[in-house]
Interface confidence: medium
Amino acid sequence: SLYVPCAPSPCVNGGTCRQTGDFTFECNCLPGFEGSTCERNIDDCPNHRCQNGGVCVDGVNTYNCRCPPQWTGQFCTEDVDECLLQPNACQNGGTCANRNGGYGCVCVNGWSGDDCSE
């Protein structure tokens, strides 16, 4: 039987096949893929902008930042307001004070410790 390079197409991940000779083909890959048959997802993480300890997670022609608990946003640059998230973060009447990358408690009436529980 006659071999036709692009029938069926060897290109994967949405790549488009183009016959370049009697027995040869070329795959035109969609953005984010590479390889002779578009089989590889290009790692976008070498170019990441994740901040504040955020971890880059590769996607297709993009990436996402997995942020530590204290940070949020596309690049982990927005401070999480722990005082809003945890209304009882400070015990015994202590006042919660949000800070960049964390929070602190201002204790009253002789209480002490990170959460005014001592």
């Epitope: 290009i42 170019n47 902008r49 022609n61």
Partner: antibody
């Protein structure tokens, strides 16, 4: 399109601010606004970039740190402040929009800065 | 900063011929490399991005290859209009690699 302005003839030691104005688009996430210069008859030299998103990350060539400052002054303008200019800073200064993800780069025509006594 | 070393500084070739320009990065830049064409009195024009992706409107006679530290730009079926200076450029952010250009290669057509 992009257009640079502010190029001038100045004396050594002077300061100068260049402005890059975008037409037809406003700054948003996904690309950088950059400054590149080219001395007469010489090659291209990268100066600095600022991320167009709200985070405004800035990146500088090591030789440019301290003497050059890139900033976004509005959603359509980027400035480059230059201090302590020397004769070696004489060049055409280009503003460019860069992205590595889809190749949609855009350059202005350039503005000439001449430093001479 | 990453240092981009481009060779040769100049090359002469005939119409219909092929030219290959090499670019070496001082550290791995993955595939974050662009190639530009510049003619006198004009800003640079993007030809290739991500080492091998053809920019919009650029003829397929231009092709880019490589990753890591070694890259090439090949121009085949040379035309008179290809006479220009060509630059490679790293364009990554993760390790502050941004922006470094090679010294340029002047292509002259015989």
């Amino acid at each position: 399109s992009l257009e640079e302005s502010g190029g001038d003839l100045v004396k050594p030691g002077a300061s100068l601010t260049l402005t890059c104005t975008a037409s037809g688009f406003s700054f948003s996430s996904g690309y950088d606004m950059c400054w590149v210069r080219q001395a007469p008859g010489k090659g291209l030299e990268w100066i600095a970039c600022i991320y167009a998103g709200s985070e405004g990350f800035t990146y500088y060539a090591s030789w440019a740190k301290g003497r050059f400052t890139i900033s976004k002054s509005s959603s359509t303008t980027v400035t480059l402040q230059m201090t302590s200019l020397t004769v070696a800073d004489t060049a055409t200064y280009f503003c460019a929009r860069w992205t590595d993800s889809d190749g949609s780069n855009l350059w202005g025509p350039g503005t000439l800065v001449t430093v001479s006594s | 900063d990453v240092v981009m070393t481009q060779t040769p500084a100049s090359v002469e070739a005939a119409v219909g011929g092929t030219v290959t320009i090499k670019c070496q990065a001082s550290q791995s830049i993955s595939s974050y490399l662009a190639w530009y064409q510049q003619k006198p009195g004009q800003p640079p024009k993007l030809l290739i991005y991500r080492a091998s992706k053809l920019a919009s409107g650029v003829p397929s006679r231009f092709s880019g290859r490589g990753s890591g530290t070694q890259f090439t730009l090949t121009i085949s079926d040379l035309e008179c209009a290809d006479a220009a200076t060509y630059y490679c450029q790293s364009n990554s952010y993760g390790n502050n690699w941004v922006g470094g250009f090679g010294g340029g290669t002047k292509v002259e057509i015989k």
